[in-house]
């Protein structure tokens, strides 16, 4: 067992004339995904076959939007690698498909839009254990670059994860017959895997995967006893030395194969013929289509409609994920303006706009002062979302219509008293003040601290505030 | 290799409930779907409920509000609470189990459900 890794370094145009166009736009931002479909050996397959070492697809990358006039860079790339777990031997020869989707981001109906950008293919020698591949593929305009390698899991070893290692049990060396497993010189390699379901009392094996019987005993898989009485129609001649076999289970008998898979009995063991979407030892493993139900929260599946093609979810607003299993938090981007109030009603987002606001987003200004007067010659000033009145002297109140008290805030310092007056206020101010607002004191001799006062006014008189 | 265990199929009268469960065991990548589909004698197989290891959940038109899917994670399984069972319902339902990362996915041998009076 292992996994099959791919970095993808970078999807843009290739090299020479006719550079691509950005498969983005201001009014359609998108984003990349990737899917890789992995098939043993190097036959020429159609793209539609079975992916069966395995497939995979990417996150989605980051949103892009075209700059106009730019031309189309290398685009931004989703995260991570793309695994493709495989559970049995890697097979060193192999067959790769590497697909570029667009999923666009527009405010179209059903979600977003799908689309295949590019699809590149390739048939490549590779060992288990090795250094990172790098490849460079074209498709049209297209350039993708990438690497790869497969690496075994633990305990498995070699070039194609078949060999085991185990840590070693004694400090000094490995148990009788087991070598120290390169490269990992402090772990041993394990006795052979033999068969699955070989039995452990019966059974042996010198190659991986085979099941060799002792003496009594038969069947591929070591579980029956070959019988000592005399016997009509055996199945082949006995080991034991008097009698035959039973006619007991062949390969084939009880049908070991899975969803409507033929057995037929090989030399060895037996072989199953699966029906289309089906593959695997047994049949057991089958591709995902839209026939699964992948696609959650009303996400509408396309493609997959038959066994050995991929499927894709469209999401409907407010959910995403390869198969629209997540929430968006729609309000998190605050798309509401001007402090407006964001609410995600499930099917819509809606926005409460502040007083003076309006538009879906809350992006229109109002005109406050259209259609407002203030009175008594007020000035009407825009602002926040709410007109506001500007008063002349004398007048105040929303719209200038109250008479102003301009004593009111007692504007007159140090004890000084004040008078309403038809041009304003007249600070009458207390002994040793002056000014219009009796902010100044009178030193004792006479003078008066900054400003002097004006010609014919004697300190103490009142002070008319212009 | 992911291997699937059924079990709870029986007969039941009209009415009556049901519930299936499903226990997943070998490689059960984290991010994966499992659910129930089943078929009925002559007929394809369809899905009946499936549930996404993240809780998101999708159920056949036909059996809302009379079924009910639900898994625990950290035992790999699925459960199917079946009520108000109708004749209709008699199929083999069978236990499905497949991986996101990989679009791979495997089906368990099957338990026969027989709605009867």
């Known amino acids: 067992a292992g996994v099959f890794e791919l970095q993808i370094h970078s999807f843009g145009p290739g090299p020479g004339p006719g550079a691509p166009r950005s498969p983005c736009s201001a009014r359609l931002p998108c984003r990349l995904f990737f899917r890789v479909c992995l098939k043993p050996g190097l036959s020429e397959e159609a793209a539609e076959s079975p992916c069966a070492l395995g497939a995979a697809l990417s996150a989605r990358g980051p949103v892009y939007t075209e700059q106009p006039g730019a031309p189309a860079p290398d685009l931004p790339l989703p995260d991570g690698l793309l695994q493709v777990p495989f559970r049995d031997a890697w097979p060193g020869t192999f067959s790769f498909i590497i697909e570029t989707w667009r999923e666009e981001l527009g405010d179209q109906i059903g979600g977003p839009a799908w689309s295949l950008l590019a699809r590149v293919a390739g048939r490549r020698r590779l060992a288990a254990g090795g250094p990172w591949a790098r490849d460079i593929q074209r498709a049209g305009a297209w350039e993708l670059r990438f690497s790869y390698r497969a690496r075994c899991e633990p305990p498995a070893v070699g070039t194609a994860c078949t060999r085991l290692c185990r840590p070693r049990s004694a400090p000094s060396r490995c148990g009788p017959g087991l070598r120290p497993c390169a490269p990992l010189e402090d772990e041993c390699e394990a006795p052979l895997v033999c068969r699955a379901g070989c039995s452990p009392e019966h059974g042996f094996c010198e190659q991986p995967g085979e099941c060799r019987c002792l003496e009594g005993w038969t069947g591929p898989l070591c579980t029956v006893p070959v019988s000592t009485s005399s016997c009509l129609s055996p199945r082949g001649p006995s080991s034991a030395t008097t009698g035959c076999l039973v006619p007991g289970p062949g390969p084939c008998d009880g049908n070991p194969c899975a969803n409507g898979g033929s057995c037929s009995e090989t030399p060895r063991s037996f072989e199953c013929t699966c029906p289309r979407g089906f593959y695997g030892l047994r049949c057991e493993v089958s591709g995902v289509t839209c026939a699964d139900g992948p696609c959650f929260n009303g996400g509408l599946c396309v493609g997959g409609a038959d066994p050995d093609s991929a499927y894709i979810c469209h999401c409907p607003p407010g959910f995403q994920g390869s198969n629209c299993e997540k929430r968006v938090d729609r309000c998190s981007l605050q798309p509401c303006r001007n402090g407006g109030l964001c609410l995600d009603l499930g099917h819509a987002l809606r926005c409460r706009c502040r007083a003076g606001f309006a538009g879906p987003r809350c992006e229109h200004d109002l005109d406050d002062c259209a259609g407002r007067a203030c009175a008594n010659g007020g000035t009407c000033v825009e602002g926040g979302g709410a007109h506001r009145c500007s008063c002349a002297l004398g007048f105040g109140g929303r719209d200038c219509r109250e008479r102003a008290d301009p004593c009111a805030a007692r504007p007159c310092a140090h004890g000084g008293r004040c008078y309403a007056h038809f041009s304003g206020l007249v600070c009458a101010c207390a002994p040793g003040y002056m000014g219009a607002r009796c902010e100044f004191p009178v030193h004792p001799d006479g003078a008066s601290a900054l400003p002097a006062a004006p010609p014919g006014l004697r300190p103490g008189d009142p002070q008319r505030y212009l | 290799e992911v291997q699937l265990v059924e079990s709870g199929g029986g007969l039941v009268q009209p009415g009556g409930s049901l519930t299936l469960s499903c226990a997943a065991s070998?490689?059960?990548?984290?991010?994966?779907?499992m659910g129930w589909h089943r078929q009925a004698p002559g007929k394809q197989r369809e899905l009946v409920a499936n549930m996404h290891s993240g809780g998101s959940t999708n159920y056949a038109d036909s059996v809302k509000g009379r079924f009910t899917i639900s898994r625990d994670n950290a035992k790999n399984s699925v459960y199917l609470q079946m009520n108000s069972l109708r004749a209709e319902d008699t199929a083999v339902y069978y236990c499905?189990?497949?991986?996101?990362?990989?679009?791979?996915?495997?089906w368990g041998q099957g338990t026969l459900v027989t709605v009867s009076s």
């Open positions: 070998g490689s059960t990548f984290t991010s994966n779907v």
């Open positions: 499905r189990w497949y991986g996101i990362q990989r679009a791979e996915g495997y």
